[in-house]
């Protein structure tokens, strides 16, 4: 299920001309969407333009993270009096245009959503032959994209004087609560975010000192659901195994 | 897995009413257009209507315009199509398909059909 | 309102090559899907966008779009491809969807 917000809707005005009454250059998208990992989701952007019955080459792009500087993720073409806008780049082959430009609509859709998604998008139309003109979303629309907790990697690791350590690491939005439970185990350890990976999607929680053998569990919630994942700890011989 | 499927087809009464429903599973039902198709027995594929991701836009072919109804609730993931004013010529097994593509895009998944037979 | 017209039989021969037209005015500058439809069974989609395929689709299954005709091309015929296969696009004067009439592919 997919949840549009429509909060604030840009119309920014950029250059007039010759049309009466003056039509502006504005775009029309909301603020956020929401939608979870693995489902699809769509991308509001209508736009006006001062070009009255424009029907020379058009080019709408869609970029991902910045305006104006921000790499291209979709971009199509549509020629002189075509209605086709015909796609020269989809990345990963998930993005999909659903308005029609000629019909001032550059709606996308993003299918096979993952947390690397979760960002903001700006559309921007580019008119060429006869009018050169163009015009980009300035704050564009955020996709926010939500995940159920999916543990990525749990371990057991050296630590200081013969001891061993655990770690384990989660991905998720909202992003998940870890806690450790095992042999002689309290509460476990509170979970510290990861150094900035996976767009602030990470988390990260350390078990410092692992004292007894048995076994170690790391449970990962969010308010989308939780998961656990385990370690084995046998010490002989100075040495260890986990699973 | 997308699945499409249908209910609500049977035999009617010339001048009759019918509704025919499409339950959608396995994607995002609110982020695509949906459509009907039917198939006259013996005959080939007939394009009826579409309804765009949000409900905003309905186009209809003119065999059918202002006596089908196609709408749907993305809240239950599922597509309509209210019959009205039903002729004989409406006799066919009809299909409820998914728009896989851009605006101007195809049919990527279909619903098993469903026979509409309208006679008196 | 675009129309499509496609002739209503081809015949080949396994293992030989199946071209199916489809005609219409400046077919060239829209998008053409191919539909096959078996007997008793929902169409499916067997190249979309002039040329691509979908994924479970043998490469057996081709498609060129120029001028005022669209073609799928099969190669090596099986006896399994023996259905009607349809074309289709998007009448952007309408916003409308427009199929052909069908062609039914027999193998011999």
């Known amino acids: 299920f997919v949840r549009t917000k429509i909060d604030t809707t840009e119309n920014l005005l950029n250059t007039e001309v010759h049309s009466s009454p003056v039509q502006r250059w504005s775009m029309q998208v909301p603020a956020e969407v929401s939608a979870a990992a693995g489902d699809a989701a769509v991308l509001p952007c209508t736009f006006t333009h001062p070009h009255r019955h424009y029907d020379g080459p058009l080019t709408a792009i869609w970029r991902a993270g910045e305006p104006y500087a921000g790499p291209q993720v979709f971009r199509c073409a549509a020629a002189r009096g075509s209605e086709l806008c015909q796609t020269a780049l989809s990345l990963h082959g998930r993005f999909r245009l659903l308005g029609n430009p000629r019909r001032n609509d550059l709606s996308l859709r993003v299918e096979r959503l993952a947390l690397a998604d979760d960002r903001r998008y700006f559309c921007r139309v580019e008119f060429a032959g006869d009018v050169h003109d163009r015009y980009e979303s300035r704050h564009g629309v955020r996709l926010h994209v939500t995940a159920a907790p999916r543990i990525i990697n749990i371990s057991v690791l050296p630590g200081p004087a013969h001891a061993f350590r655990a770690l384990c690491t989660t991905e998720g939005e909202p992003p998940p609560a870890l806690a450790w439970s095992g042999p002689a185990l309290g509460n476990g350890s509170a979970a510290v975010p990861s150094s900035g990976q996976g767009h602030g999607h990470l988390v990260t929680a350390e078990l410092p000192a692992l004292n007894h053998d048995g076994r170690y569990t790391c449970t990962a919630a969010n308010s989308l659901g939780r998961s656990e994942a385990s370690v084995y700890l046998f010490r002989f011989h100075g040495a260890s195994a986990s699973t | 897995q997308v699945q499409l499927v249908q209910s609500g087809g049977g035999v009617v009464q010339p001048g009759r009413s019918l509704r025919l429903s499409c339950a959608a599973s396995?994607?995002?039902?609110?982020?695509?257009?949906m459509h009907w198709v039917r198939q006259a027995p013996g005959k080939g594929l007939e394009w009826v209507a579409v309804i765009s991701y949000d409900g905003s836009n309905k186009y209809y072919a003119d065999s059918v315009k202002g006596r089908f109804t196609i709408s749907r609730d993305n809240s239950k993931n599922t597509l309509y199509l209210q019959m009205n004013s039903l002729r004989a010529e409406d006799t066919a097994v009809y299909y409820c398909?998914?728009?896989?593509?851009?605006?101007?895009?195809?049919?990527?998944?279909w619903g098993q059909g469903t026979l509409v037979t309208v006679s008196s | 309102q675009s129309v499509l017209t496609q002739p209503p039989s081809v015949s080949v021969a396994p293992g030989k090559t199946a071209r199916i037209t489809c005609g219409g005015n400046?077919?060239?500058?829209?998008?053409v899907h191919w539909y096959q439809q078996k007997p008793g069974q929902a169409p499916v989609l067997v190249i979309y966008d002039d040329s691509d395929r979908p994924s479970g689709i043998p490469e057996r299954f081709s498609g060129s779009n120029s001028g005022n005709t669209a073609t799928l091309t099969i190669s090596r015929v099986e006896a399994g491809d023996e259905a009607d296969y349809y074309c289709q696009v998007w009448d952007s004067s309408s916003d409308h969807r427009v199929f052909g009439g069908g062609t039914k592919l027999t193998v011999l």
């Open positions: 396995g994607f995002t039902f609110s982020s695509y257009a």
């Open positions: 398909a998914r728009e896989g593509g851009s605006y101007y895009g195809y049919f990527d998944y």
């Open positions: 400046n077919i060239g500058s829209k998008s």
